[in-house]
């Protein structure tokens, strides 16, 4: 869910999760175009991960799951079902991805009309 996503990103990374609410073409609600930088690629990957979870019958934005923050690292579980496992891995992945990036202020509140209609394919 949204709470878990914010929590996991805050656990691993050096920045507040709010920094990614409206960033580039993919960080925030929705998303399309060519990712603008490494952060945007992380968000694109996370969108793909959530899409795969939805295809598996999960509800990424509302499903809650248990996880722990230990030494700035996300530990998933104990999970009750496959959806909780998948979603924690999605959020764990983006948290680790974002923690390795540099922040470009010019992409904060990036105008969506500058984002191309087509997006890179998911892996």
């Amino acid at each position: 869910g949204i709470l878990e996503l914010a929590g996991t990103v805050g656990c691993v990374g050096p920045r507040t999760p709010i920094a990614y609410m409206k960033y580039g073409c993919f960080c925030g609600l929705g998303g399309h175009g060519q990712p603008r930088d490494a952060i945007d690629w992380c968000c694109h990957g996370h969108d793909c991960c959530y899409t795969r979870a939805e295809e598996a019958g999960c509800s990424p934005k509302t499903e809650r799951y248990s996880w722990q923050c230990v030494n700035q690292s996300v530990l998933c579980g104990p999970a009750e079902n496959k959806c909780q496992e998948l979603l924690c891995k999605c959020d764990q992945e983006i948290a680790n991805c974002l923690a390795q990036t540099e922040y470009n202020l010019k992409y904060l509140f990036y105008p969506q009309f500058l984002c191309e209609p087509d997006s890179p394919k998911c892996d």
């Epitope: 104990p78 009750e80 496959k82």
Partner: antibody, heavy 114, light 112 residues
């Protein structure tokens, strides 16, 4: 109806090995992490192991780590617990379960004694 | 590890009366996602444990509404109103906030 049926328990000498099985039915087995929980002769419940739905992640308490191995065969809807270097304190009734969701199986008894 | 403590090994009760069974955790089981990862189980004589309550206060399906759960992050209570003969057994609390999953020692409900 969700059903879990354990088998494979028995009497083993200290240091010996044994493999428990659990046949699952009535639900989509591959969609759920599965666990083994044991109940000691003193009636205490102890978590023994958990395996993720796909079988790629496993979790153990320190008391069995390195001695017990949990595995699963999603094609056969079966959960396993391979136990080695068994000790007298492993004597218990072993349940196959989805602890947070239920139900639990009826259990299979392991006795470790010389 | 999170230690689950059930202080009372047994609780005597008269059929028709209400009874409360307590459980305490060594760490708050309230997750940042708003869920309290506390469960209650009943093990009737000769049977395997069955889930009664999940997430501290949610009634499992098929469980009579005579059962209810409440608590804070570390102190929990299972309440049974109008106790019946079929309620006899051992009640266990369990946490699934983190590994290792841990259980209380159990509280035996006995009829007077």
């Amino acid at each position: 109806e969700v059903k879990l049926v354990e088998s494979g328990g028995g009497l083993v000498k200290p240091g010996g090995s044994l493999k428990l099985s659990c046949a699952a039915s009535g639900f989509t087995f591959s969609n759920y992490p599965m666990s083994w929980v044991r109940q000691t002769p003193a009636k205490r419940l102890e978590w023994v192991a958990t395996i993720s739905s796909g079988g790629d992640d496993t979790y153990y308490p320190d008391s069995v780590k390195g001695r017990f191995t949990i595995s699963r065969d999603n094609a056969r809807n079966t959960l396993y617990l391979q136990m080695s270097c068994l000790r007298s304190e492993d004597t218990a009734l072993y349940y196959c379960a989805r602890p947070q969701l239920g139900p639990w199986g009826q259990g299979t008894t392991l006795t470790v004694s010389s | 590890d999170i230690v689950m403590t059930q202080a009372a090994p047994s609780v005597p009760v008269t059929p028709g009366d209400s009874v409360s069974i307590s459980c305490r955790s060594s760490k708050s089981l309230l997750h940042s996602n708003g869920i309290t990862y506390l469960y209650w189980f009943l093990q009737r004589p000769g049977q395997s444990p069955q889930r009664l309550i999940y997430y501290m206060s949610n009634l499992a399906s098929g469980v009579p509404d005579r059962f209810s759960g409440r608590g804070s992050g570390t102190d929990f209570t299972l309440r049974i109103s109008r106790v019946e003969a079929e309620d006899v057994g051992v009640y266990y609390c369990m946490q699934s906030l983190e590994y290792p999953l841990t259980f209380g020692a159990g509280t035996k409900l006995e009829l007077k």
